[in-house]
């Protein structure tokens, strides 16, 4: 004969554990049902009655099967330098990530607590290491024979064009100027850009349309300009 299926609450066999999505209640000394994600335990089980679950209250969530008496509070609204990549629902916390041009200066378990603007390298300096989701841009002086004439968080130093006859020699912040209209060899005229860091979580880089409440929360304010490092600007 097949073993009889026990319905919660039930006393487990000595030495055995409760089944999946059940927990052992110490007070009742019974295996009882857990509550599903998006719910919490409103009334704990007894020897004769199972757990009573209730939906999470507004702005709270539970992500796992649980028997917590209260759901967890969602994090604060995302600040203006952030994008909400996951909304607060009954089953998941809000996740805020930094918008393009910013990086996460202070991360939390999921998403970012504090975003800061990516450093911009000033003319004469180029990007040595591009910014990522969690690290700032590193600038370096343009080596002899290269230049950058932009203030940018993505442009690297580019080689000077090579002239038959040089009218004005190039320097770290300016390309060489040739007397003839056609230099013997020229690099591609467009600035060289490094790719912006893209949030791996985000399905989109633009904030999703919101109700009239614009996200701008008290402890999630953008940091001021990043501290000036050599060759960087806080603009």
């Amino acid at each position: 004969l097949p073993a009889q299926v026990a319905f919660t609450p039930y006393a487990p066999e000595p030495g055995s554990t409760c089944r999946l999505r059940e927990y052992y209640d110490q007070t009742a000394q019974m295996c009882c049902s857990k509550c599903s994600p998006g719910q919490h335990a409103k009334v704990f089980c007894t020897k004769t009655s199972d757990t009573v679950c209730d939906s999470c209250e507004d702005s709270t969530y539970t992500q796992l099967w649980n028997w917590v008496p209260e759901c967890l509070s969602c994090g604060s609204r995302c600040s203006s330098d952030q994008v909400e990549t996951q909304a607060c629902t009954r089953e998941q916390n809000r996740i805020c990530t930094c918008r393009p041009g910013w990086y996460c200066a202070l991360s939390k378990q999921e998403g970012c607590r504090l975003c800061a603007p990516l450093r911009k390298c000033r003319p004469g300096f180029g990007v040595a290491r591009p910014g990522t989701e969690t690290s700032d841009v590193v600038c370096k002086p343009c080596a002899p024979g290269t230049f950058s004439n932009t203030t940018s968080s993505t442009d690297i130093c580019r080689p000077h064009q090579i002239c038959n006859v040089v009218a004005i020699p190039g320097n770290a912040s300016m390309d060489a100027v040739c007397t003839s209209t056609s230099p013997t060899r020229s690099m591609a005229p467009g600035a060289v850009h490094l790719p912006q860091p893209v949030s791996t979580r985000s399905q989109h880089t633009q904030p999703t349309p919101e109700p009239s409440t614009a996200p701008s929360t008290s402890f999630l304010l953008p940091m001021g300009p990043s501290p000036p490092a050599e060759g960087s600007t806080g603009d």
Partner: antibody, heavy 120, light 108 residues
Framework: QVQLVQSGSELKKPGASVKVSCKAS????????MHWVRQAPGQGLEWMGR????????KHDPKFQDKAVLSSDTSVSTAYLQISSLKAEDTAVYYC?????????????WGQGTLVTVSS | DIQMTQSPSSLSASVGDRVTITCTAS???????LHWYQQKPGKAPKLLIY???NLPSGVPSRFSGSGSGTDFTLTISSLQPEDFATYYC?????????FGQGTKVEIK
């Protein structure tokens, strides 16, 4: 754009009941709550209750538990407030307002209000 | 129930004045759950500040909010003619959710 449009003014006799509607447009009704707030003439705002249109779950101020019935019809994106056993002191403007789930109850859009006058 | 008490109940001020309205809760309210509304005569209330200190888009930066626990403040840094209205605080921390009695800001 987001709009909450309420039904027109009502004049009722004591003991009667009234049903006020609030039609929503410009947003998804799924992850919002619809609240009802009343304001007696020259008085402040009083929260009466709220409904989750997706589930029909309601929550009331106990003061209005037996007085007000909240309902909604998602097929026409409309929330309703029915007030029974009307008395002169129920004369007020009744507002519907929405709060998105996850916004900690901030009511970001309001209806224009419905004046209910109870007089014999 | 959590009682919300605003002070003053009314005040007279001139254009350009700095105005401060306080809201005291009878028990502690999480800052995320404290909001302020502005209401003009014959109009529906309008969300002015959410979660203690945050301005919805379109609300001028002369409005600001602060506070924690039981004491919260709404400040208008430089009163403008269109700011003459009644202001309400609102807690959503514990049901039933309650409003302050309102503070009427009038022209001096």
């Amino acid at each position: 754009q987001v709009q909450l449009v309420q039904s027109g003014s009502e004049l009722k006799k004591p003991g009667a009941s009234v049903k006020v509607s609030c039609k929503a447009s410009g947003f998804n009704n799924k992850d919002i709550y619809m609240h009802w707030v009343r304001q007696a003439p020259g008085q402040g705002l009083e929260w009466m209750g709220r409904i989750d249109p997706a589930t029909g779950n309601t929550k009331h101020d106990p003061k209005f538990q037996d007085k007000a019935v909240l309902s909604s019809d998602t097929s026409v994106s409309t929330a309703y407030l029915q007030i029974s056993s009307l008395k002169a002191e129920d004369t007020a403007v009744y507002y519907c307002a929405r709060s998105p789930y996850g916004d900690f109850g901030a009511m970001d859009y309001w209806g224009q209000g419905t004046l209910v006058t109870v007089s014999s | 129930d959590i009682q919300m008490t605003q002070s003053p109940s009314s005040l007279s001020a001139s254009v350009g004045d700095r105005v401060t309205i306080t809201c005291t809760a009878s028990s502690s309210v999480s800052s995320n759950y404290l909001h302020w509304y502005q209401q003009k005569p014959g109009k529906a209330p309008k969300l002015l500040i959410y979660s203690t200190s945050n301005l919805p888009s379109g609300v001028p930066s002369r409005f600001s909010g602060s506070g924690s626990g039981t004491d919260f403040t709404l400040t208008i840094s430089s009163l403008q003619p269109e700011d003459f209205a009644t202001y309400y605080c609102h807690q959503y921390h514990r049901s039933p959710w309650t409003f302050g009695q309102g503070t009427k800001v009038e022209i001096k």
